[in-house]
């Protein structure tokens, strides 16, 4: 570093736990949503909706801000006629992504409030509430059974109602299919023309019963009891229906795939192609046999268009196919050979001909790198326009590709906008104009732009605010690295502090995810718990995606089938000794964590011995560990590790119980709420009883009838400065024990 | 694909009985509806009677009831349609259809058919 450099490094201030709350740091998404060929739907840091016209150039306010905050309402949604708003209010988390809600109706702009009902109840809690495609038709979900309504004013009328609250869910998901499957709380779908409505009914009856305990509040516990199947238990059962909307309510249900290897199988993924063909995704239980078929919602006969299968398991079942106008021709993405790194995801175009049962299908993409989503087709246009890592695995670029002729490909992001190679994208609805919304690695910004030359038409939202917040501090410098393992080359991420040099000792802190198929290393913008680690405590941080992370192959991905654990502690272990190659890394601060699957792996990595045999790490904390897969979900334990049941040894050979007995003097700190509706806390009482037995050194820290979120930004906090305080300890105890180490050798002089 | 076989059809006196039968094959699919119509030249189809396969819940039109009887032999993956007390306005094609479960027993939606038999009642 200059001196100048140094100088105005130390005006800056430290990033700190308050910093991460503050709204200086909080990063505003306006929530850009297109609602025609030329306008979209946004919402200012003030908190004003308005709609934008980019051809015109000129705003329109819908609702004010001040409207949404005497409403008290966390969501709001505009009727697709732009006449009425729906509000949500005392909004109460259940799971991840489901709520339930009081929400009321208001005409635009200034409206008085009108409670939304069903019929028979008054101020009813609903678990869900959205307009449908067409002028102001709605439905809502009331003790799991589908209400709709035709337009504002008219009476709400049941049109599902075998819903039995906690057993038999009607739109909705249960805990796995939210957690695991669908991945939202929303299994309903809309057809286009608003005629017809498609749900899932989710039977959980047979699935077993997990209490979840309240400690606090009452003289005596009490228990919420849910169904969450564990590895091997019954299944939730799941049919889709299509109800017609116009005229009596008609329901019908979609034939499932008759195939013996789909006798117990999850719906993954459902689109209306068009107003009476629905595209569904069939899996079977063992994850390695998908169907995707298209389903005619007048007779329920669904016809199979494409048939996957693996020798591990089957990724990414959630995506959705993109149709043309008539539904004969579209595009969805799936995993193709690519040589020696095995299969990359791309895109493949089925078309069919009008008198012809066979399809004809194409690749439009190829090459050692993934599409990660599909965005539009560009029908007139003859374009599809998507998101890669051609560029790099750790980037997101926007691209285009001719979807006739040679497939010629364009990148349309790259180089566009200043500190970003990290994009999410949407177009309007004639694919005119798009919104390109930047994660990374700068501070996330959102600009207008015309497809036809890529051209800004101008900023809708740069978080000025954050970037002056981030310029006054000391943020971690980020640097990039290959490591090579067993003909891999893996992605390494590291931080390190702003007034690095590399003649101090720095202790080192290793952060692990490696859920199969995530990706730790990416050029996204993040101010996180490790950034305060970094910047006000002096440490560097080191991220690795390993076997068994995604968007490198699928021969990368499916390396730790069955043997969860194994490689990804070989491979996090090479990363932590290519550090401890380098002269400012102090061997005796060397430090793990991770939550959840990154909470097994610090488990399992914590008592990892280095080259001379010496314990590698002086401590190591985990959040919410999985320490045994049979007690934790079967839709996700079952992809990895098979049907339990069948063969448990895979299962027997991941538990963290065979590694711990290894754990010496580390200080290893476990975290985890009582009320963890995920990974319940009986995973920690089981690793604590090994811990016990071991005669390990541990602490434990509980957040009394908590959820796996930690919904509450005061636990939140409470949560990181713990955290980072044990690590700060950690890294200081080791400056003790060198004094004192240093004081012996000299008496011993 | 889902086939279907309708046998038993035929000439009869009025107040005799048929029994019609109906072979499934080409589906392990256990949750059809399947259902009979018949048909009179230059009329519409009309619902005579549908069971669910899955539960053996039953539908009759108001004109057959307590004449006619639906059930089904699940080993022999069979539905049959016992007609008593058979009446001239009963002559017709009978058609054997499966569809997909639906809250309707009984509608036109069925995804598939069978050729159909001939019943004759002669006064």
């Known amino acids: 570093l200059t001196p100048a450099e140094d100088n105005s490094l130390s005006q800056k201030k430290k990033v700190t736990v308050e910093d991460l709350f503050s709204e200086d740091f909080k990063i505003h998404d306006p929530e850009a949503k297109w609602i025609s060929d030329t306008e979209f739907i946004y919402r200012e840091q003030k908190g004003t909706v308005r709609l934008w016209n980019v051809e015109t150039n000129t705003s329109t306010v819908l609702i004010e801000g001040k409207k949404i905050e005497s409403l008290r309402a966390i969501r709001y949604e505009i009727s697709p006629d732009r006449e009425y708003a729906l509000f949500s209010y005392n909004v109460e988390p259940i799971y991840q992504h489901s709520y339930t809600g009081y929400y009321v109706l208001s005409k635009i702009p200034h409206g008085d409030p009108q409670s939304l009902d069903p019929p028979e109840v008054s101020n009813a809690k609903l678990q869900y509430a959205g307009w449908g495609p067409k002028g102001q038709q709605l439905i809502f979900i009331f003790e799991n059974n589908i209400y709709y309504c035709a337009h504002v004013g008219k009476q709400a009328i049941r049109v599902v109602s075998t819903g039995k609250e906690g057993v038999i869910y009607n739109g909705l998901s249960d805990w796995l299919y939210e957690e695991e499957i669908l991945k939202t709380h929303i299994a309903h779908w809309w057809s286009p023309d608003g005629t017809r409505l498609a749900y899932a009914a989710i039977n959980d009856s047979r699935v077993p019963i997990m209490e979840l305990p309240t400690y606090t509040g009452s003289i005596y516990p009490t228990v919420k009891p849910y169904h969450y199947p564990k590895a091997g238990s019954e299944n939730p059962s799941i049919s889709l229906h299509v109800i017609g909307l116009n005229g009596p309510t008609h329901d019908l249900e979609m034939m499932p795939p008759d195939d013996p290897r789909m006798r117990e199988y999850y719906i993954t993924m459902v689109k209306w192609a068009t107003s009476t063909k629905v595209a569904v995704t069939w899996l079977n239980r063992a994850q390695n046999v998908s169907i995707l078929t298209l389903c005619d919602a007048t007779t329920g006969v669904c016809t199979k268009k494409h048939e996957d299968e693996s020798e591990a398991w089957l990724h990414r079942q959630n995506e959705e196919p993109v149709f043309s106008k008539d539904g004969r021709k579209f595009f969805f993405i799936r995993a193709i050979p690519q040589g020696g790194r095995g299969k990359f995801y791309h895109i493949t175009v089925s078309s069919s001909q009008p008198n012809s049962s066979n399809d004809n299908i194409q690749s439009i993409t190829s090459g050692d790198w993934d599409v990660t989503k599909i965005l539009a087709y560009d029908e007139k246009g003859n374009k599809i326009y998507f998101l890669s890592t051609e560029d790099l695995p750790r980037r997101r670029q926007l691209y285009s590709a001719n979807t006739v002729g040679n497939f010629n490909r364009q990148c349309l992001s790259c180089d566009l906008v200043e500190n970003c190679t990290y994009f999410s994208a949407s177009f309007s609805h004639s694919m005119d104009f798009f919104l390109l919304k930047c994660e990374g690695p700068g501070v996330p910004m959102v600009t207008v732009h015309n497809t036809t030359d890529k051209k800004k038409m101008f900023d809708l939202e740069t978080n000025e605010h954050v970037k002056k917040a981030i310029n006054d501090r000391q943020m971690p410098k980020v640097e990039y690295r290959d490591i090579e393992i067993d003909d891999y080359n893996l992605p390494m991420q590291i931080l390190k502090p702003a007034t690095f040099t590399d003649t101090t000792h720095y202790p080192l802190l290793l952060v692990v995810d490696g859920t199969p198929g995530s990706q730790s290393v990416a050029e996204k913008f993040e101010v996180s718990w490790e950034t305060v680690m970094v910047s006000s405590h002096g440490a560097v941080v080191v991220k690795c995606d390993g076997r068994g992370s995604g968007f490198q192959g699928t021969k990368l991905l499916h390396e730790v089938r069955r043997r969860l654990g194994l490689l990804e502690e070989k491979d996090q272990m090479e990363a932590v000794r290519t550090m401890l190659k380098e002269q400012y890394i102090d061997r005796t601060r060397v430090a793990v964590f991770g939550k959840d699957y990154g909470g097994y792996l610090s488990t399992y990595i914590l008592p990892a011995k280095g080259e001379n045999q010496g314990q590698t790490f002086t401590c190591g904390s985990a959040l919410s560990p999985i320490t045994d897969f049979k007690l934790y979900a079967s839709a996700f334990s079952e992809r990895y590790l098979g049907l339990h049941g069948l063969d448990n040894r895979a299962y027997e050979m991941t538990k963290v119980a065979h590694r711990v007995s290894a754990l010496e003097e580390q200080q290893f700190l476990i975290i985890h709420p009582t009320a963890d509706e995920k990974i319940h806390f009986q995973h920690t009482a089981e690793l604590i009883t090994q811990l016990i037995r071991g005669k390990a050194n541990y602490s434990l820290q509980i957040y009394p009838d908590e959820s796996h979120y930690f919904t509450s930004s005061s636990l939140k906090q409470h949560l990181y400065r713990s955290i980072i305080n044990f690590f700060v300890e950690c890294f200081r105890i080791q400056d003790k024990l060198l004094t004192v180490t240093a004081k012996e050798d000299e008496e011993e002089d | 694909q889902v086939q279907l076989q309708e046998s038993g059809g035929g000439s009869v006196q009025a107040g005799g009985s048929l029994r019609l039968s109906c072979a499934v094959s080409?589906?392990?699919?256990?949750?059809?509806?399947m259902g009979w119509f018949r048909q009179v030249p230059g009329k519409e189809r009309e619902g005579v009677a549908a069971i669910y396969r899955s539960d053996g819940r039953t539908y009759y039109a108001d004109s057959v009831k307590g004449r006619f009887t639906i059930s089904q032999d699940n080993t022999k993956n069979t539905v049959y349609l016992q007609m008593n007390s058979l009446k001239p306005e009963d002559t017709a094609m009978y058609y054997c259809?499966?569809?997909?479960?639906?809250?309707?027993?009984?509608?036109?939606?069925?995804?598939?058919w069978g050729q159909g038999t001939q019943v004759t009642v002669s006064s």
């Open positions: 259809a499966a569809g997909a479960y639906s809250s309707y027993l009984m509608d036109a939606n069925f995804a598939y």
């Open positions: 080409g589906s392990s699919y256990s949750r059809f509806r």
